[in-house]
Amino acid sequence: MMTGTIETTGNISAEKGGSIILQCHLSSTTAQVTQVNWEQQDQLLAICNADLGWHISPSFKDRVAPGPGLGLTLQSLTVNDTGEYFCIYHTYPDGTYTGRIFLEVLESSVAEHGARFQIP
């Protein structure tokens, strides 16, 4: 039975040209996290594998940085980066947990960031 829950940064906004941290946290389960995939729509951005570490898609390697933790840092943001991002936790024996983050990249310099997510 899957008992875990994913907490995410939720809906966030950032300035064009700036950077943002996408963060998810899996709690309430003792399942082993074997891999976390970060996706934008149906595009794979990055993988963090428990055994083999981080892998960043060649298409995004100049603008995506691993971490902190299992999170992902997006850099040099453009308005085209606006959209849904998903953290997909592959666990054993529970299976898959998915978290959703909506990022809005604003032209304005008055972009208000959502409350920053803190990992306990």
Epitope: Q35, E39, Q43, L44, I47, D51, H55, I56, T96
Partner: antibody
Framework: QVQLVQSGAEVKKPGASVKVSCKAS????????MHWVRQAPGQGLEWMGI????????SYAQKFQGRVTMTRDTSTSTVYMELSSLRSEDTAVYYC??????????????WGQGTMVTVSS | EIVMTQSPATLSVSPGERATLSCRAS??????LAWYQQKPGQAPRLLIY???TRATGIPARFSGSGSGTEFTLTISSLQSEDFAVYYC??????????FGGGTKVEIK
């Protein structure tokens, strides 16, 4: 040209171990993942695990955890797969296969010729 | 683990005809899917990677399509050398990387 050459066929008794080698040539050995896949007679393909030849990091299928060990020798561009506590169900052809670059992921573009391992008392 | 399901298990086709093979993933693998061909007594050979990109030296009659969970391998006009077993594989989540059970393409 790029190729993977595996060691020869083996016959083992139940409970024994087998170590299969896979020598790579024609490319930069540490730059690509190496996988091991097996195929029992008349059956499909079964992934066993992966090794990063540069760092020696490994990841194994749960089914083989504790019984399989993958290692590499960068000086000879060779990877090894050792399977212990053999049983009759381990009778299969064992393949090494080159995966994607260690910076990303990829399909298996080069395969060894296969090594037949027979487990019989 | 991601379960890959291929259909049909066996496909009987006449030479020159079109063959359509299906592969379904139990969860999205984006476009991180490969197709392999295997003939008796031989190692598998990579045909398609990235769901739709032909590997080096693979004839244009082989084409792949799909994304997410549904994928198709099409052989536009079967040649005698195309009769073999075909496997799909996801290579985005491990352990374990997983293969489909295979589709045997046989002469009708």
């Amino acid at each position: 040209q790029v190729q993977l050459v595996q060691s020869g066929a083996e016959v083992k008794k139940p409970g024994a171990s087998v170590k299969v080698s896979c020598k790579a040539s024609g490319y930069t050995f540490p730059a690509y993942y190496m996988h091991w896949v097996r195929q029992a007679p008349g059956q499909g393909l079964e992934w066993m695990g992966i090794i990063n030849p540069s760092l020696g990091l490994t990841s194994y299928a749960q089914k083989f955890q504790g019984r399989v060990t993958m290692t590499r020798d960068t000086s000879t561009s060779t990877v090894y797969m050792e399977l212990s506590s053999l049983r009759s169900e381990d009778t299969a052809v064992y393949y090494c296969a080159r995966g994607g670059r260690t910076t990303w992921i990829g399909a298996f573009d080069i395969w060894g010729q296969g090594t037949m391992v027979t487990v019989s008392s | 683990e991601i379960v890959m399901t291929q259909s049909p298990a066996t496909l009987s086709v006449s030479p020159g005809e079109r063959a359509t093979l299906s592969c379904r993933a139990s969860q999205s693998v984006s476009s991180n899917l490969a197709w392999y061909q295997q003939k008796p007594g031989q190692a598998p050979r990579l045909l398609i990677y990235g769901a739709s990109t032909r590997a080096t030296g693979i004839p244009a009659r082989f084409s792949g399509s799909g994304s997410g969970t549904e994928f198709t391998l099409t052989i536009s006009s079967l040649q005698s050398e195309d009769f073999a077993v075909y496997y799909c594989q996801q290579y985005v989540v491990w352990p374990p990387l997983t293969f489909g059970g295979g589709t045997k393409v046989e002469i009708k």
